[in-house]
Interface confidence: medium
Amino acid sequence: TTPEPCELDDEDFRCVCNFSEPQPDWSEAFQCVSAVEVEIHAGGLNLEPFLKRVDADADPRQYADTVKALRVRRLTVGAAQVPAQLLVGALRVLAYSRLKELTLEDLKITGTMPPLPLEATGLALSSLRLRNVSWATGRSWLAELQQWLKPGLKVLSIAQAHSPAFSCEQVRAFPALTSLDLSDNPGLGERGLMAALCPHKFPAIQNLALRNTGMETPTGVCAALAAAGVQPHSLDLSHNSLRATVNPSAPRCMWSSALNSLNLSFAGLEQVPKGLPAKLRVLDLSCNRLNRAPQPDELPEVDNLTLDGNPFLVPGTALPHEGSMNSGVVPAC
């Protein structure tokens, strides 16, 4: 006997569906109607045939009352080939729901998204996360998706993007977006970051995550942020192979005074990199390759500095007179 594709937990809080059959019984998902968190994985299926069974152009207002009654706040949809028209149909219906967080992962969106009809209402999401989602429309995908969303989006995460750069002239500003996460786009690089950070489109960003994005130097990132007018309070550059030295011909970059937290952990650093902000509240240099305690003048003025997991602090590799600072606990680096 094949296992049930959908499982609802005892609290009716979380419901997970894995549709792996070639001809899945989609009606099984109805047991998720009482859940707050819903995950639907479609096993890599092509949902094109679905279009024949639903009227993607039907007025979604007819479903408004039913959809409003759903408890779902977080929805994850993964592993499918989805026609853009079907995605739009789903977004139009979900606009009447209380959905706040939407995650799309391992999806291939085919075709182009039609423009938002004048009478349609956008989806009032606070968080949108995309991982390994490819769009047939190339660089204009964000602008196309954005018109189906209300302008209150606070968190946007785009990982493993096939086109992490956006068509900036088509993108509207994200006035409420405080967190932008472009992590896990190893091909992005500093030039790609400049292209992705459309100038003046992200005026409210406080947290910017760029883990594993092919960044090379803090100074190069500083230049990209300055060019875009982006002034985060917190910047995560961990899991990049950072160079400690700055190209002497590169112009000096003045970091925004708004930046107070910088994560440079797991960056392969053998010394504290040049060109850091003059003053920080938090600096994370853990799990690098620092062979000695940094001299104060190599560091910004900082209230909270993390150095765990560097060779000079690991028991057995401590320098003379430096063992007294070791806790004996080696962090998992």
């Epitope: 305690a293 001299q295 104060p296 560091l299 003025e301 909270n304 500095l305 993390t306 150095l307 600072m325």
Partner: nanobody, 122 residues
């Protein structure tokens, strides 16, 4: 918490000498630039002399050839030998140090001592 303790100030005749000492204590990891600054009543604090970890010293023009700054890295200490003192050297002398230290986590910032009074009489 980190503290800088100065000593050696006092009253001295013009042409005389004094040696100021300053020791940093607390959970110190390393000490970068150390130095001495002075302030007379109603004036700005001015740099007298500074010395980096490697022992490279810088002096204000007014004290060159008369004052000598030195440091002991093992003791996290800095010293100022003041010779040929004159009335213009009367001031409160402050020790300054750039310190990487450990509290709950590490931190790096500039610290100042409480100051020691040097009075040169004629």
């Amino acid at each position: 918490q980190v503290q800088l303790q100065e000593s050696g100030g006092g009253l001295v005749q013009a042409g005389g000498s004094l040696r100021l000492s300053c020791v940093a204590s607390g959970n110190i990891r390393s000490v970068g630039d150390m130095g001495w600054y002075r302030q007379t009543l109603g004036d700005q604090r001015e740099m007298v002399a500074t010395i980096d970890y490697g022992g490279v010293a810088r002096y204000a023009d007014a004290v060159k050839g008369r004052f000598t700054i030195s440091r002991d890295n093992a003791k996290s200490a800095v010293y100022l030998q003041m010779n040929s003192l004159n009335r213009e050297d009367t001031a409160v002398y402050y020790c300054n140090a750039d310190i990487l230290y450990k509290s709950d986590s590490y931190a790096r910032r500039e610290f100042w001592g409480q100051g020691t009074q040097v009075t040169v009489s004629s």
